[in-house]
């Protein structure tokens, strides 16, 4: 057993070396180890074949180190590995696409808070057993096509707290088992109409705190199992373009947050869900007809990116404008700083407690959020609780199979990984 470690055999052969100030993966780790705990050290590099002798390894924790480099063959030979935690290694920045190849039994992969700027092609190839993938709190700007294609058993995908600006058509291809998709606190301004095509089992979708002014209902149509939808803290444009989303929300039987309007000005702060259909009139084209807020591509129906309902009609040119407002009015969305670079709610009207990811119940109090940050280990962000509360409900004994949403979700527990010290 390496000097800084404790090794024991029951109930699993374990080599435990946490918080020992180690600067390298120790030599002499028993080959029979099933669990290796190396978290909280000063390890900066994982060389090739570091654990090759440990054929029985099922759990490897390397979180909260100072990893800057992981050799592509670092995890070679770990065919039985089930849980790999590399989180809280902010200097990592990138991972060689071959790093996880051969980890056919891996079911949990923690890559949160690793400073990742991109997901290389084929990074998750062959991880057919993966169920939980933690990619939150990185610096990801894009979701390349087919990144998750092999992850047919993935149930939880955490992508929040990144810099993702759009959700392309093939971003989530192959995720047929996905139950929870957390995309909040990004910079998403556009969701492709077919982005969620494979997500027929998705139950929870968080898109709050992004840059969405519109959302094609075609994107939501495949989400047959959806129960929890959070769309608050986005610069929603509540004009004729929002009618399909409004209609979809009226029919939605699950739980959804408020969808506070940003434009037109007369509806700013109002909840789209509670508007009447005839509130959604005209078009809030605030920067002139050639610079619409609408970000969709030009099509036959949408020349210049203007949706059909906004196109000037010879009979009624005024219909494309919000009634009573000039076309040159200042665009309230212009210069909106993406989430993460500004205080919560910046650019989307006053932020009330009903902007919590869980919405608000009718009539509940709405004091403004404080800017106070809780204990040091917690990143600033959005609360876990929301609608306040149905007292006296019966006790539930729900297990978070691994990760329970409810902090966002806890039939009693926490999930995921990252808040290290």
């Amino acid at each position: 057993c390496p000097g800084a470690c404790v090794c024991y055999n029951e109930p699993k052969v374990t080599t435990s070396c946490p918080q020992q100030g180690l600067q390298a993966v120790p030599v002499g780790i028993p080959a029979a180890s099933q669990r290796i705990f190396l978290h909280g050290n000063r390890i900066s590099h994982v060389p090739a074949a570091s654990f090759r002798a440990c054929r029985n390894l099922t759990i490897l924790w390397l979180h909260s180190n100072v990893l800057a480099r992981i050799d592509a063959a670092a995890f070679t030979g770990l065919a039985l590995l089930e849980q790999l935690d590399l989180s809280d290694n902010a200097q990592l920045r990138s991972v060689d696409p071959a790093t996880f190849h051969g980890l056919g039994r891996l079911h949990t992969l923690h890559l949160d808070r690793c400073g990742l700027q991109e997901l290389g092609p084929g990074l998750f190839r062959g991880l057919a057993a993966l169920q939980y993938l933690y990619l939150q709190d990185n610096a990801l700007q894009a979701l390349p096509d087919d990144t998750f294609r092999d992850l047919g058993n993935l149930t939880h995908l955490f992508l929040h707290g990144n810099r993702i600006s759009s959700v392309p058509e093939r971003a989530f291809r192959g995720l047929h088992s996905l139950d929870r998709l957390l995309l909040h606190q990004n910079r998403v301004a556009h969701v492709h109409p077919h982005a969620f095509r494979d997500l027929g089992r998705l139950m929870t979708l968080y898109l709050f705190a992004n840059n969405l002014s519109a959302l094609p209902t075609e994107a939501l149509a495949p989400l047959r199992a959806l129960q929890y939808l959070r769309l608050n803290d986005n610069p929603w444009v509540c004009d004729c373009r929002a009618r399909p989303l409004w209609a979809w929300l009226q029919k939605f039987r699950g739980s959804s947050s408020e969808v506070p309007c940003s434009l037109p000005q007369r509806l700013a702060g109002r909840d789209l869900k509670r508007l009447a259909a005839n509130d959604l009139q005209g078009c809030a084209v605030a920067t002139g007809p050639y610079h619409p807020i609408w970000t969709g591509r030009a099509t036959d129906e949408e020349p210049l990116g203007l949706p059909k309902c906004c196109q000037p009609d010879a009979a009624d040119k005024a219909s494309v404008l919000e009634p009573g407002r000039p076309a040159s009015a200042g665009n309230a969305l212009k210069g909106r700083v993406p989430p993460g670079d500004s205080p919560p709610g910046n650019g989307s009207g006053p932020r009330h407690i009903n902007d919590s990811p869980f919405g608000t119940l009718p009539g509940s109090a709405e004091p403004p959020l404080t800017a106070v940050r809780p204990e040091g280990s917690e990143p600033p962000g959005f609360p876990t609780s929301g609608p306040r509360r149905r007292p006296g409900c019966s006790r539930k004994n729900r297990t978070r199979s691994h990760c329970r949403l409810g902090q966002a979700g806890s039939g009693g527990g926490g999930t995921g990984d990252s808040e290290g010290s």
Epitope: H160, F358, S377, Q407, G413
Partner: antibody, heavy 125, light 107 residues
Framework: QMQLVQSGAEVKKPGASVKVSCKVS????????IHWVRQAPGKGLEWMGG????????VYAQKFQGRVTLTDDTSTDTAYMELSSLRSEDTAVYYC??????????????????WGRGTMITVSS | DIQMTQSPSSVSASVGDRVTITCRAS??????LAWYQQKPGKAPKLLIY???RLQSGVPLRFSGSGSGTDFTLTINSLQPEDSATYYC?????????FGQGTRLEIK
């Protein structure tokens, strides 16, 4: 800095009820998940119940079901724990605690990160 | 309900020693376990959550590890102020349950 400030000690007679308050400062109650834990003299910690944000409901330990009620007043950022039909074995220090579970970081780590100082409830005839 | 069993129930050690407390769950709780320290007359204080995550402000001599059903809290280089009772708690589901506690005394 966030704090949980609890109401003062009380002495109650068997069969009576008691209502303990827990005022949140430095945060709004609506942002938090508050739980209640008690500790009888010389004994260990016992979870009584708390708020489960996923299901937007309050959950209770079976042992206290029907006798304990957890409520909130969001206008004053105060959580309450009411225990009825008191008996001598309910003599304990009652703590409110804030669940770490935080939506950011996907890590809904559910552990009690901040505690009130406790409220001593003595049940005696 | 998930039962949590701590051992030993009490331990006595000297300043500078390394102390290990174990906690066993009656069923698999993955890594969803927290450790608390409680001193007489005070509220408990969170040390570690998610089995191995050190809470902000907790000295590095405290570390946690384990997954599934067996977990350990290790205190390296014991200090006089570490005299307290230590509790584990499973955070995997409701009802949240605590271990019975381990009393640590400094010789």
């Amino acid at each position: 800095q966030m704090q949980l400030v609890q109401s003062g000690a009380e002495v109650k007679k068997p069969g009576a009820s008691v209502k303990v308050s827990c005022k949140v400062s430095g945060y709004t109650l609506s942002e938090l998940s508050i739980h209640w834990v008690r500790q009888a003299p010389g004994k260990g910690l016992e979870w009584m119940g708390g708020f489960d944000p996923e299901d937007d409901e309050t959950v209770y330990a079976q042992k206290f079901q029907g006798r304990v009620t957890l409520t909130d007043d969001t206008s004053t950022d105060t959580a309450y724990m009411e225990l009825s039909s008191l008996r001598s074995e309910d003599t304990a220090v009652y703590y409110c605690a804030r669940d770490l579970g935080y939506l950011t970081s996907g890590n809904y780590y559910n552990a009690f990160g901040i505690w009130g100082r406790g409220t001593m409830i003595t049940v005696s005839s | 309900d998930i039962q949590m069993t701590q051992s030993p129930s009490s331990v006595s050690a000297s300043v500078g020693d390394r102390v290990t407390i174990t906690c066993r769950a009656s069923q698999d709780i993955n890594r969803w376990l927290a450790w608390y320290q409680q001193k007489p007359g005070k509220a408990p204080k969170l040390l570690i959550y998610a089995a191995s995550r050190l809470q902000s402000g907790v000295p590095l001599r405290f570390s946690g590890s384990g997954s599934g059903t067996d977990f350990t809290l290790t205190i390296n280089s014991l200090q006089p102020e570490d005299s307290a009772t230590y509790y584990c708690q499973q955070t995997n589901n409701f009802p949240r349950t605590f271990g019975q506690g381990t009393r640590l005394e400094i010789k």
